[in-house]
């Protein structure tokens, strides 16, 4: 549904939304896999949390993310079609005081230990481009999506709106 | 303003496909999902499918083997085709757009007047 | 397919009553979950969405709860306005179903 500009033009305003309300619309627990099944874990090493992508042994338990809703609003002077806009941002936190984060200097998903109000490296925007998956978008950096990448979670970027659905850059939520 | 238009023919023939288009403006396709919703006369609304913000398309289960979603960017146009028509498809069909950008968690914001399609010989 | 059971199927109420509807999703679906008033011959408008929030223009006297599966519309003080059909509907997983309605009639 992209013209020829494709991921830049309709994520452009993305750096200048703004979120409306400190406190998020709704949060709730979920396990996190991809869109072949794969979970997405954390473990504590080094004193530091390590994110894997991987197969679970059949009654192995899925860790579980806490997903933080926010809604974020687009003045129609920004949004580049004349309306104002609302888009669905997301925190995850796996564990207390810890957050998703988007380096994205380094291309990489990390956990950071940090206070709120949190940084806009832990915002992601919500789509879900694919029929009950999502994908999470980095606030600081339009049009560069939470992906898997040699089962870890890295940062892609997406450079048209084909790659939108690119399985690896989909997921699944689940409170089971 | 946000606006959607449906049109197409109101009569279709039983066994038939039937066409229709949404019309939009006032917002760009490439950040809000379309959706396609009918009504059966004195009856409660269905949702038949969606094309979404990225270009994908998802439908009804139970209606998916006899419809097409399509769309025509540079006419701000979505199109629903249902084939095989019978006199249960009777029904005022709405499109409608996504509250949100990028997803439809939060619900259809804004509707089309609606038309009504009647399936008959 | 996620089932949405709303109660009750009609209601009578006088202008300034408190009128509560209900509905019932067959699996948890969060916070995704919209209300619609439809009057005849009229599209539906959305009223609320994300189960508690307002959608814009829309009056303060209606209000959302619930969360999970169990989820509730109230019209704290009914004006003559809003004599229509409501409808629930979840937004947590294709295909993205609607309640059966209910109709909010005179008294």
């Known amino acids: 549904a992209f013209g020829i500009s494709g991921v830049q033009k309709y994520t452009r305003a993305l750096h200048d939304s703004s979120i409306t309300g400190i406190s998020p619309i709704t949060e709730y627990l979920a396990s996190l896999s991809t869109y072949n099944d794969q979970s997405i874990t954390f473990a504590l090493e080094d004193e530091s949390y390590e994110i894997y992508v991987e197969d679970l042994k059949k009654d192995e338990k899925k860790d579980k993310v806490l997903l933080s809703y926010y809604e974020s609003q687009h003045p129609s002077n920004e949004s580049g079609d004349g309306v104002d806009g609302k888009m669905l941002m997301v925190t995850l936190s796996p564990t207390k005081d810890f957050w998703l984060h988007a380096n994205n200097k380094e291309h990489s998903v990390e956990l950071h230990k940090c206070e709120k109000p949190l940084p806009d490296q832990a915002f992601f925007v919500l789509h879900n481009m694919h029929s009950n998956c999502v994908s999470f978008e980095c606030k600081t950096d339009p049009g560069v999506f939470i992906g898997v990448k040699d089962n870890h979670l890295a940062l892609i970027k997406v450079d048209s709106s084909e790659n939108l659905c690119t399985e690896n850059i989909l997921f699944k939520l689940s409170e089971t | 303003q946000v606006q959607l238009q449906e049109s197409g023919p109101g009569l279709v023939k039983p066994s038939e496909t039937l066409s229709l288009t949404c019309t939009v403006s006032?917002?760009?396709?490439?950040?809000?999902?379309v959706h396609w919703i009918r009504q059966p006369p004195g009856k409660g609304l269905e949702w038949i499918g969606v094309l979404r913000a990225g270009g994908t398309i998802s439908y009804n289960s139970a209606l998916m083997s006899r419809v097409t979603i399509s769309e025509d960017i540079s006419k701000s146009q979505v199109s629903l085709k249902l084939s095989s028509v019978t006199a249960a498809d009777t029904a005022v069909y709405y499109c409608a757009r996504d509250h949100y950008y990028y997803s439809s968690f939060g619900g259809f914001a804004s509707w089309g007047q609606g038309t009504l399609v009647t399936v008959s010989s | 397919d996620i089932q949405m059971t709303q109660s009750p199927s009609s209601v009578s109420a006088s202008v300034g009553d408190r009128v509560t509807i209900t509905c019932l999703a067959s699996?948890?679906?969060?916070?995704?979950l919209a209300w619609y008033q439809q009057k005849p011959g009229k599209s539906p408008k959305l009223l609320i969405y994300a189960a508690t929030r307002l959608a814009d223009g829309v009056p303060s006297r209606f209000s959302g709860s619930g969360s999970g599966t169990d989820f509730t519309l109230t019209i704290s003080s009914l004006q003559p306005e809003d004599f229509a059909t409501y409808y629930c509907?979840?937004?947590?997983?294709?295909?993205?179903?609607f309640g059966q309605g209910t109709k909010v009639e005179i008294k």
């Open positions: 699996q948890t679906i969060g916070a995704w």
């Open positions: 006032g917002f760009s396709l490439s950040k809000y999902g």
């Open positions: 509907q979840q937004l947590n997983s294709t295909p993205y179903t």
